[in-house]
Amino acid sequence: YYFCYHHVTKLDEVAASQLTFPAVTLCNLNEFRFSQVSKNDLYHAGELLALLNNRYEIPDTQMADEKQLEILQDKANFRSFKPKPFNMREFYDRAGHDIRDMLLSCHFRGEACSAEDFKVVFTRYGKCYTFNSGQDGRPRLKTMKGGTGNGLEIMLDIQQDEYLPVWGETDETSFEAGIKVQIHSQDEPPFIDQLGFGVAPGFQTFVSCQEQRLIYLPSPWGTCNAVTMDSDFFDSYSITACRIDCETRYLVENCNCRMVHMPGDAPYCTPEQYKECADPALDFLVEKDQEYCVCEMPCNLTRYGKELSMVKIPSKASAKYLAKKFNKSEQYIGENILVLDIFFEVLNYETIEQKKAYE
């Protein structure tokens, strides 16, 4: 018994005069805007996006929207076309949804915010945006009160008219419409494809948060990793950083390239490498390989407990007004607009701390 290193877990609620607001990362579930896909993009990435077959032809499809099909048929006419160099990172950057077009309104603690307050970040969903990233020398925003008026409220247009037609199942095309959101500490990168939650158009979604500070013990009392990150890519250790680090190594090892969202200096995967290696390899790692990416718990971490609720938007009463305000049809408003409210429930944080049972 003397050699048993027991621990106890202490729970505490700590009142605070202010709390650091978390980073909020959001991604449109559609990775590439239809209007931004050029003839050269289609030539290089058409098969990856299931828009072309392996003979550079539009596949036989009864599912196509006539207008979209007409545009694609014109772009897919490669007679006398000379392909230009193509880079997946540049494609994601140029063709991904632009926060300046999506963001219809933004308020933090009642004050107006704008697209400039969102930093571009690449994830497996492509071009995404983080509010309050705390990077580029910007201070981390604070909040002094709990409740909806003291957090972030944004209205977004998800731009479904720009969604790529889905004529096949690929990792780069989505059956869903909306955004994915992750609320996370500024000390860890987003891992939104695995840890994000979905927000649907046609709803105002309220996310009530509670900050939780977790303190774990290292061996032999617990299993946390007390060492600083052994990584070329991240400054501080987190499970997310470790997993991204590991996924990058796995892809470079299997495919000799990295996905657009992965750090490092390996070459970016080509569309062919995405299709033939990177997508299936990463799917295998995430779904099947239980051993390659074993990431230890850090000794200190901040997470955010969340409670979600939703109401319909627009109401019958406001549909006409919003349609006029944004110069869109009522149907467009119903299919594309969402409001997201993220706030602290109360101005306190919870500590969950492992302590040695006896010294």
Partner: antibody, heavy 116, light 107 residues
Framework: EVQLLASGGGLVQPGGSLRLSCAAS????????MSWVRQAPGKGLEWVSG????????YYADSVKGRFTISRDNSKNTLYLQMNSLRAEDTAAYYC?????????WGQGTLVTVSS | DIQMTQSPSTLSASVGDRVTITCRAS??????LAWYQQKPGKAPKLLIY???NLESGVPSRFSGSGSGTEFTLTISSLQPDDFATYYC?????????FGQGTKLEIK
């Protein structure tokens, strides 16, 4: 180039033992799970056993459980299959394969014949 | 264990024919299915992985489709070199299992 080279097959009497080896090259051996697959003469493919990259987890087909032991030496980039209490129905070509999002490559196979 | 049922077990066809081989899993295996071609005395050759991905160097007349429990391998226009035995394999979960094989022979 990623390569697997299976060896150690031969003729053995029923009840006897044999140890197969599979030498790997061209990839980080310890990062990948590995499997043995066999094929009896004129028959189909049968998965025999698998092992995780570290060697911590092992898996067996019911037909060989308790008789065969899979192991690996990551310092030597080698996979092993220790076969005990061999039976006539274990006669087959044994292939080693690298497990991942695709099972590629396979070794060329080593023939095990169990006969008196 | 997951059972893989392949059909037909024998298939007679002529050069230029379009042929389809099906594989049914006893429970969902997502897309973790591979197709192999094997010729007598040789190791299996990977054709398709993750249900629909064509292995590098494999002619484009081979294609795979399906997910969940139903999968197909299609050869769009049979060539003389394609007469062989074909196997499907699930690698979704241990114990990994193969179909019983489809022997493709000249009509």
């Amino acid at each position: 180039e990623v390569q697997l080279l299976a060896s150690g097959g031969g003729l053995v009497q029923p009840g006897g033992s044999l140890r197969l080896s599979c030498a790997a090259s061209g990839f980080t051996f310890s990062s990948f799970a590995m499997s043995w697959v066999r094929q009896a003469p004129g028959k189909g493919l049968e998965w025999v056993s698998g092992i995780s990259g570290s060697g911590v987890s092992t898996y067996y087909a019911d037909s060989v459980k308790g008789r065969f032991t899979i192991s690996r030496d990551n310092s030597k980039n080698t996979l092993y299959l220790q076969m005990n209490s061999l039976r006539a129905e274990d006669t087959a070509a044994y292939y080693c394969a690298k497990e991942a999002y695709k099972w590629q490559p396979w070794g060329q196979g080593t023939l095990v014949t169990v006969s008196s | 264990d997951i059972q893989m049922t392949q059909s037909p077990s024998t298939l007679s066809a002529s050069v230029g024919d379009r042929v389809t081989i099906t594989c049914r899993a006893s429970q969902s295996i997502s897309s973790w299915l591979a197709w192999y071609q094997q010729k007598p005395g040789k190791a299996p050759k990977l054709l398709i992985y993750k249900a629909s991905n064509l292995e590098s160097g494999v002619p484009s007349r081979f294609s795979g489709s399906g997910s969940g429990t139903e999968f197909t391998l299609t050869i769009s226009s049979l060539q003389p070199d394609d007469f062989a035995t074909y196997y499907c394999q699930q690698y979704n979960s241990y114990s990994y299992t193969f179909g019983q094989g489809t022997k493709l022979e000249i009509k």
